[in-house]
């Protein structure tokens, strides 16, 4: 038998330092967590003391704080070099600022294999990308060698800006071929490594035959064995065991999130490559393990360059702002109410006596919130903490749609709601009540909009015929997060200002601000 | 002592048939894929055919394809190449290897066919 | 003619470093390991390095490996007498589906 220790990420998001324990900036020292200073702690420990280790990264390094603002991914590769990773797969982040934005600092900086068995190229850019990132990559362990695939999800263009020189196939059908010539060269030890969220992480696993183990990320999803050591509730057992069609177990993993934990999976595989057991879980990347030295100097000799954004303070805070996935994907969270107003704000025209404003909803989906701002530090509101809850870049737009329109998009919100997607929409100028015991597609039993042609703004029942102005994310008027039908069916769209300028211009002309939750959105059951 | 061993080989006329065996010793067997590589007389290595440990698949080179078959039998820890409709540019030492990781990490003595008239 | 292109010979004398280069393209050296065997004259040939750049338990370390795009290499340094063989590269061609060997390349110690 031989024994195989894998170690994983994923979804990190740009969270080099280390955080609070939601993942936001680190306040207290004492009990923060994660960043790659310790990563590197713990990952040297295993190296040292284990034979047969593999540290691998399932995508989204990119995205999420003002490191990826300021360095636009070459933190990443720096820093993913110094711990020498074995292998990454790219994640759907990975695209944000382009392929360019991808091949420049990342691709051709870092010195191990970055992977996507479905991402084919094409046009100009088959030739440029070529060799940049790999289907598949083999390994040498000691003795023995292991097979990498990656995969991303083919939700990619919707979720980012690969371009239209890159084809984002199905899954199994590009990993199945990869897997069976990596089999025809008898590599018989497989690694599915890969960024399609947990879901498809099992029907990898089920359905590639040949893959003996999955890595995955994008759905951020914790799994555990025992009982969990921070908030996070484990969706499962690690390693989540899924039975494959041809009858073997297969392991499947993740990591959570944000570098908050280090996946520790052991393998064991016979002489033929078939896993014997497999058992592990993640580690908790605590206080109580130490930063390392040399990487947390290089950190802080790369942090110099952000200072200027950080030290800014913009306003002051009074209350937890809640940005978290847990609320902003589920229910009203206060960070999303924040941020519509101060989206609407930025849009006050007062240019015709009969509207008290041209416009007075707004639209954003929880998923585009990526972290929360706590509040116990001062009450300071930095351009940092800005860039961690709205990392994308994206510019906040008006559109005009009619009222069929986005009685679709509030339906299409909740269509699959409790699984932690990005497409529950926070709102502002808005009153919306869900009935969840209802079908999808026909779980909106109330939908009112407050009046812009009002001396006093009240909220009326949505008129399906009716054209509305609303401001939202680019991202959605571009059709993000499945809302195909804002893109289909938008009257007009004009582009407006960067996000994260919006809200801090907003939180600088308020001082101090404490958004509530106030019943924007309700859930109810029966008849109405 | 980790080894393989060909046989089979000798002369035979054009069009004829000759079955080389490749015996396997001092490892698992069922454990790996497996290749014949040849060798002209003077002339550089040329891969003839090979089989996957797993799943049994078989692959050919297009100089061969219709006239060879690779197959094994794990019990008797054997390779064979059954070559069919031989032809003189067939001639050549035909090489039993073990394909190990993502290569060819053990080589046979090799047996020499010689296709004459 | 063999799909991986090598020099048919090349020489050194003792002590000397040479490189023998492998050229290939995208759908085998390109996306594929090389791989690189020596074979002593009169006897089957035994692999060397594995994985591009990775050597075989008991190989000495005089002999190296790399890869980029669509070429290898093999480099010795060092060279003694009994490095005097024929050298090939070979790797899996995706196109074809089958292994590919470089022609060979006749290694002469002066």
């Known amino acids: 038998a031989w024994e195989l220790t894998i170690l994983h990420t994923n979804d990190v998001h740009s969270r080099l330092e280390q955080t609070s324990e939601d993942s936001s900036k680190c306040v207290n020292a004492s009990r923060c967590m994660g960043g790659v200073a310790r990563l590197f702690t713990k990952v040297q420990q295993i190296r040292r003391a284990e034979p047969n280790v593999l540290l691998l990264d399932a995508g989204d390094q990119y995205q999420g704080t003002i490191w990826f603002t300021v360095y636009k991914g070459a933190e990443v590769a720096h820093f993913m070099n110094a711990l020498r990773y074995d292998a990454m797969a790219l994640g759907n982040h990975e695209f944000d600022n382009g392929v360019e934005g991808l091949i420049e600092p990342l691709l051709k900086e870092a010195k191990f294999p970055i992977l996507s068995a479905n991402i084919k190229a094409k046009g100009p850019l088959a030739s440029q990308i070529s060799g940049l990132y790999l289907p598949y990559k083999v390994l040498p362990v000691g003795d023995e060698v292991v097979g990498i695939v990656g995969y991303t999800s083919k939700e990619t263009p919707f979720l980012s800006n690969p371009g239209t020189n890159l084809v984002f196939e199905d899954e199994i059908t590009a990993l199945q071929p990869e897997v069976d010539k990596l089999k025809t060269l008898n590599v018989n030890k497989i690694i599915a490594l890969g960024h399609s969220g947990f879901e498809m992480d099992k029907l990898i696993a089920q359905k590639v035959r040949g893959v003996d183990v999955v890595v995955g990320g994008h759905s951020n999803t914790f799994l555990y064995t025992g009982n969990p050591p921070s908030k996070e509730v484990p969706a499962g057992k690690y390693p989540f065991i899924v039975t494959s069609d041809d009858g073997r177990k297969v392991p499947v993993v993740q990591a959570y999130a944000f570098g908050k934990y280090l996946g520790y999976l052991k393998i064991e595989f016979d002489e033929r490559g078939n896993v014997i057991s497999s058992h592990g879980n993640p580690i908790l990347l605590n206080s109580s393990i130490p930063e390392d030295p040399s990487i947390k100097a290089d950190i802080n000799k790369w942090r110099i360059k952000l200072d200027n954004y950080s030290t800014q303070e913009l306003g002051k805070t009074i209350v937890y702002l809640d940005g978290s996935s847990q609320s902003c994907r589920f229910r009203e969270c206060n960070m999303g109410n924040l941020i519509c107003d101060a989206m609407i704000n930025n849009n006050l025209r007062h240019t015709d006596e009969m509207f008290w404003n041209h416009v007075s909803m707004c639209i954003l989906n929880g998923g585009g919130i990526r972290s929360p701002i706590d509040e116990r530090n001062n009450g300071t509101i930095t351009w940092e903490n800005l860039a961690a809850v709205l990392p994308f870049g994206g510019t906040f737009d008006l559109v005009q749609l009619k009222g069929s329109t986005l009685k679709k998009a509030f339906e299409h919100s909740v269509h699959r709601y409790g699984q932690s997607t990005g497409e529950f929409l926070q709102v502002g100028g808005i009153h919306v009540v869900y009935d969840l015991s209802r079908k999808p597609g026909d779980r909106v039993v109330k939908l009112d909009v407050l009046c812009t042609k009002c001396r006093v703004p009240s909220y009326d029942p949505l008129k399906m015929d009716e054209v509305y102005k609303v401001i939202l994310p680019n991202f959605l008027a571009n059709g993000g997060d499945g809302f195909q039908m804002i893109k289909d069916e938008l009257l007009r769209h004009d582009s407006g200002d960067q996000d994260i300028n919006v809200v801090s211009t907003y939180i600088s002309k308020m001082k101090v601000i404490y958004p509530a939750v106030e019943g924007r959105i309700k859930f109810s059951t029966g008849s109405h | 002592e980790v080894q393989l061993l060909e046989s089979g080989g000798g002369l035979v006329q054009p069009g004829g048939s000759l079955r080389l065996s490749c015996a396997a010793s001092g490892f698992t067997f069922s454990s790996y894929a497996y290749s014949w590589v040849r060798q002209a007389p003077g002339k550089g290595l040329e891969w003839v055919s090979a089989i996957s440990g797993s799943w049994g698949r078989t692959y050919y080179a297009d100089s061969v394809k219709g006239r060879f078959t690779i197959s094994r039998d794990n019990s008797k820890n054997t390779l064979y190449l059954q070559m069919n409709s031989l032809r003189a540019e067939d001639t050549a030492v035909y090489y039993c290897?073990?394909?190990?990781?993502?290569?060819?990490?053990?080589w046979g003595r090799g047996t020499l066919v010689t296709v004459s008239s | 003619q063999s799909v991986l292109t090598q020099p048919p010979s090349a020489s050194g004398t003792p002590g000397q470093r040479v490189t023998i280069s492998c050229s290939g393209s995208?759908?085998?050296?390109?996306?594929?390991?090389v791989n690189w065997y020596q074979q002593l004259p009169g006897t089957a040939p035994k692999l060397l390095i594995y994985l591009n750049n990775q050597r075989l338990g008991g190989v000495p370390d005089r002999f190296s490996g790399s890869k980029s795009g669509t070429s290898a290499s093999l480099a010795i340094s060092g060279l003694q007498s009994e490095d005097e063989a024929d050298y090939y590269c070979?790797?899996?061609?995706?196109?074809?589906?089958?292994?590919?060997f470089g022609g060979g390349t006749k290694l002469t110690v002066l």
């Open positions: 290897a073990r394909l190990g990781y993502s290569t060819i990490d053990l």
């Open positions: 995208l759908s085998n050296i390109g996306r594929n390991d």
């Open positions: 070979a790797t899996w061609d995706d196109s074809l589906k089958g292994w590919l």
